[in-house]
């Protein structure tokens, strides 16, 4: 069951997501608990996706998705990425908020979650490239797959934003 | 260590052209955008607008479109600040900014080039 | 586009005080806010990032705070080579503008 409704934020009154698009969840109690994701996000376990068309640098995309009160998509399990690589078109690569700042290969995501060596999806012999500092989720050919790899971090690509389901 | 180094001061007259130069050392040029300052005299800071060094687009504010260019040589990580058809306004000194990887924050400054432009 | 308004203008001020800069922004910037320094003849340096981090080897006696389109600087304990010029500027949308400037003099 779904429905849409405003969303004001509350601190200043500024609507940041007008529509949302809204999950009825059955509670213990009498009380109706709905989950939301804004309008055109994709839905996946807690979390709502936007996979962007247009393309930024990383650090433009970042402020994207920030603008929209998310951050670049932060990828916890296989299942997940797998839901994001569903909806990705494969000519595309897409930024993830994975980086690495300073080139000494110590890789950060953007919340702050701890980088797990032995949960990465690169693709083989990747990370290349010490000058290239940023992720992106792209497909190859050969073998056919997604995973990630180390690009320019001002070389505009698409992006994928993620944030928190919204309940109501 | 980062290192911006800009071009020495310049006279000119109103209708010439300037190029100012700024070379960087002390890291990977194309990983970090390249910014330019206005400062006229006895007055603040005025944001110009900045060249991504990866792909050499370049973005101008709004004031400084139509005589201003910016450009770049890669190969010798220099950015370069072209002014054409100069007038008296355009005296001031032009400094030249690194922005930082994640924020654009300007993390690393040129010592700045004093353009001066009378009859 | 974001307008920034910088207060005061110019602040005279003794050794060993306290003094409080502050710019207030036309729309949220979300922390994408930096300070820096300029003393007469030299290149700004900067002092603060996102609102709040001090840059490498900027004195702790600095202190940048603030959300929003609210944001302070702070320099405790003023120190002789604390005087000069103060620049706020934004990085949440282009064009990335400055404030006008604080002008910190000696009382």
């Known amino acids: 069951q779904k429905y849409s409704q405003l969303l004001e934020k509350k601190t200043t009154k500024e609507l940041v997501h007008t529509t949302l698009e809204c999950v009825k969840k059955n509670m213990p109690v009498e009380e109706t608990a709905w989950s939301c994701c804004p309008k055109n996000w994709k839905s996946f376990s807690s979390n709502c996706y936007f996979i962007s068309t247009e393309s930024a640098s990383w650090q433009d995309s970042e402020k994207d998705c920030a603008r929209m009160e998310a951050h670049l998509l932060v990828i916890n399990t296989q299942e997940e990425q797998d839901f994001i690589f569903q909806n990705l078109q494969e000519e595309s690569a897409y930024f993830v908020g994975l980086s690495d700042p300073e080139g000494q290969r110590h890789w950060q995501w953007v919340d702050q979650t701890p980088y797990n060596e032995s949960s990465t999806f690169w693709h083989p012999r990747e990370p290349s490239d010490p000058n290239e500092r940023c992720v992106v989720l792209n497909f190859r050919k050969s073998p056919k797959r997604w995973g990630w790899n180390d690009v320019n971090c001002l070389g505009p690509q698409r992006s994928v934003c993620e944030m928190m389901k919204i309940h109501l | 260590q980062i290192q911006l180094v800009q071009s020495g001061p310049e006279l000119k007259k109103p209708g010439e052209t300037v190029k100012i130069s700024c070379k960087a050392s002390g890291y990977t040029f194309t990983n970090y955008g390249m910014n330019w300052v206005k400062q006229a005299p006895g007055k603040g800071l005025k944001w110009v607008g900045w060249t991504n060094t990866f792909t050499g687009e370049p973005t101008y504010v709004d004031d400084f479109k139509g005589r201003f260019a910016f450009s770049l040589e890669t190969s010798a990580s220099t950015a370069y600040l072209q002014i054409n058809n100069l007038k008296n306004e355009d005296t001031a000194t032009y400094f030249c900014?690194?922005?930082?990887?994640?924020?654009?924050?300007?993390?690393?400054w040129g010592q700045g080039t004093t353009l001066t432009v009378s009859s | 586009d974001i307008q920034m308004t910088q207060s005061p203008a110019s602040l005279s001020a003794s050794v060993g005080e306290t003094v409080t800069i502050t710019c207030r922004t036309s729309g949220n910037i979300r922390n994408y806010l930096a300070w820096y320094q300029q003393k007469q003849g030299k290149s700004p340096q900067l002092l603060v990032y996102?609102?709040?981090t001090l840059a490498d080897g900027v004195p702790s006696r600095f202190g940048g705070s603030g959300s929003g389109t609210q944001y302070s600087l702070k320099i405790n304990s003023l120190q002789p080579e604390d005087f000069g010029n103060y620049y706020c500027?934004?990085?949440?949308?282009?064009?990335?503008?400055f404030g006008g400037g604080t002008k910190l003099e000696i009382k």
């Open positions: 996102n609102a709040k």
């Open positions: 900014a690194r922005g930082n990887f994640r924020y654009y924050y300007f993390d690393y």
């Open positions: 500027q934004h990085f949440w949308s282009s064009p990335y503008t």
